[in-house]
């Protein structure tokens, strides 16, 4: 009579996380008498998965009724598979012995690989804002996927980015993997409304990739441009000097007027206007009584933006000889009542 063979027909089985895995095993003979066991791994450190004779294995069910007379099918199903269940499973026949059963023959093994979806990618930007023309880094991370093969792409404003580095860890075999990618993005003045997108494609996702986004508005600082001009006035003894603060982002702004180097008034008058590109404009103006001045006046508009070093623009207000003769006290009038700093 031919000696018993343990047949595991599938060399490998791939299962999605959360599903059940069926591991097939058949014997060619009923002899010798003795139980079968399933193990994960081989050698001394192997892990018992199922013992026909005894024990409690809540996730394991047998495909056939093992106690049925002449049964040769010892296939099992393992429920609620996780990446930690990956490995090679061996169906092993034992011969009845005393006091212990003796291992008789093992199947060739079935490798169980678990397909697990990557987590939603998380994109994070730089800790501090940078100005246009500078390069900032964005990172994208996703975890818990298997198999290791994965595709990651970066996009900005309709274009795929090419300046990025991606690592999948660990380098060797593992139950699940993580991906980390860093993209370098050169900021432009128009990036207030821009987004970077990290896209992950994996076999478990099939039709729809996973995407994570970050807004460049969190990473960019567009410094303002300043222009100080004198507006024509009806009254001969008044000058209207305006400070136009243009195209800045974010909106945090403190404006101060200096008169010949001395603080004249901290201004936050006018209305904040948002431009199409997401930057802001702001205007402040002074009404200066020219009769009050015997000499020319240098008016300086000083702007502190987003906690950065102040920038300023000056304007020399010429006082005519006629006005110098008829001087009186200076009065400054803001066209609008000042509000709190932006």
């Amino acid at each position: 009579e031919d000696e018993l063979q343990v047949i595991q027909p599938e060399k490998s089985v791939s299962v999605a996380a959360g599903e059940s895995a069926t591991l097939r095993c058949a014997m060619t003979s009923l002899i010798p008498v003795g139980p079968i066991m399933w193990f994960r791994g081989a050698g001394a450190g192997r892990e018992l998965i199922y013992n026909q004779k005894e024990g409690h294995f809540p996730r394991v069910t047998t495909v056939s009724e093992l106690t049925k007379r002449n049964n040769l099918d010892f296939s099992i199903s393992i429920s609620n598979i996780t990446p930690a269940d990956a490995g090679t499973y061996y169906c092993v026949k034992f011969r009845k012995g005393s006091p212990d059963d003796v291992e008789f023959k093992s199947g060739a093994g079935t490798e169980l690989s678990v397909r697990a979806k990557p987590s939603a990618p998380v994109v994070s930007g730089p800790a501090v804002r940078a100005t246009p023309e500078h390069t900032v880094s964005f990172t994208c991370e996703s975890h818990g996927f298997s198999p290791r093969d994965i595709t990651l792409k970066w996009f900005k404003n309709g274009n795929e980015l090419s300046d990025f580095q991606t690592n999948v860890d660990p380098a060797g075999d593992s139950v699940s993997y993580s991906i980390h990618s860093t993209a370098r993005v050169v900021l432009t003045r128009g990036d207030v409304h821009s987004q970077v997108i990290c896209e992950i494609a994996h076999i478990t996702l099939q039709g729809d990739p996973l995407r994570g986004t970050a807004n460049l508005s969190e990473a960019i600082r567009v410094p303002p441009t300043l222009e100080v001009t004198q507006q024509p006035m009806r009254a001969e003894n008044q000058a209207n000097v305006t400070c136009q603060v243009s195209n800045f982002y974010p909106r945090g702004l403190q404006l101060t007027w200096l008169e010949n180097g001395n603080v004249s008034r901290t201004e936050t008058a006018s209305t904040l206007i948002e431009n199409k590109d997401g930057t802001y404009n702001w205007m402040s103006w002074l009404l200066v009584n020219t009769c009050a001045h015997r000499d020319d006046v240098v008016l300086t508009c000083q702007v502190e933006h987003d906690g950065q070093q102040a920038v300023s623009k000056s304007y020399a207000l010429e006082i005519s000889a006629h006005q110098k003769e008829h001087g009186s006290d200076i009065t400054h009038e803001a066209a609008l009542a000042p509000t709190a700093p932006l």
Epitope: S14, A16, G158, I197, H202, I203, T204, Q206, P209
Partner: antibody
Framework: QIQLVQSGPELKKPGETVKISCKAS????????MHWVKQAPGKGLKWMGW????????TYAEDFKGRFAFFLETSASTAYLQINNVKNEDTATYFC?????????????WGQGTSVIVSS | DIQMTQSSSSFSVSLGDRVTITCKAS??????LAWYQQKPGNAPRLLIS???SLETGVPSRFSGSGSGKDYTLSITSLQTEDVATYYC?????????FGGGTKLEIK
């Protein structure tokens, strides 16, 4: 070579159920999504949704939530579209189409289409 | 949902003509655009994916261009076998959406 072969034409009365099959060959069935597309007579193409053949998850376009269901018979590499309680407006040709993955989620291979006529 | 607009529903053309079919998305689709050709009674056939990549077996007289929201399918010299309806489709977001189609007819 890659092929998607759909079941034959169906004539149904309003209120009945229709089940269309799409048998795939020439590739690993569970590696690619399966999409379904409707084309009413003389009209354009309308995406109905897709089935993740690996996980079994279904995604339906808004207009196809409720009476429409996608099924799989993985062992037979076959996808199914079932329409319950059919209405006259379901009269159309229905296509299955394989969806790629990686950098290309395009529908690259299509079935020949199954004509469904709903008439009392 | 992303709307896909093919401005011309039909074109009357002569054999040998250069034909340009346009497709506009309601938002940026990051070049995830496909062009399909469908002849009466047949299933659609994929011509171009990724806005510009010609599929294997598609004649070189077909080409795709565009980015952002605006895309174009061009046929350099129209042949008899090119008479069909052409659909654009975005696959950047679900639901996948098709343009209304552009039917080419011979003058």
């Amino acid at each position: 070579q890659i092929q998607l072969v759909q079941s034959g034409p169906e004539l149904k009365k309003p209120g009945e159920t229709v089940k269309i099959s799409c048998k795939a060959s020439g590739y690993t069935f569970t590696d690619y999504a399966m999409h379904w597309v409707k084309q009413a007579p003389g009209k354009g193409l309308k995406w109905m949704g897709w089935k993740n053949t690996e996980t079994g998850e279904s995604t339906y376009a808004e207009d196809f939530k409720g009476r429409f269901a996608f099924f799989l018979e993985t062992s037979a590499s076959t996808a199914y579209l079932q329409i319950n309680n059919v209405k006259n407006e379901d009269t159309a040709t229905y296509f299955c189409a394989r969806g790629g993955y990686g950098s290309n989620y395009v529908m690259d291979y299509w079935g020949q289409g199954t004509s469904v006529i709903v008439s009392s | 949902d992303i709307q896909m607009t093919q401005s011309s529903s039909s074109f009357s053309v002569s054999l040998g003509d250069r034909v340009t079919i346009t497709c506009k998305a309601s938002e940026d689709i990051y070049n995830r655009l496909a062009w399909y050709q469908q002849k009466p009674g047949n299933a659609p056939r994929l011509l171009i994916s990724g806005a510009t990549s010609l599929e294997t077996g598609v004649p070189s007289r077909f080409s795709g261009s565009g980015s952002g929201k605006d895309y174009t399918l061009s046929i350099t010299s129209l042949q008899t076998e090119d008479v069909a309806t052409y659909y654009c489709q975005q696959y950047w977001n679900s639901p996948r959406t098709f343009g209304g189609g552009t039917k080419l007819e011979i003058k």
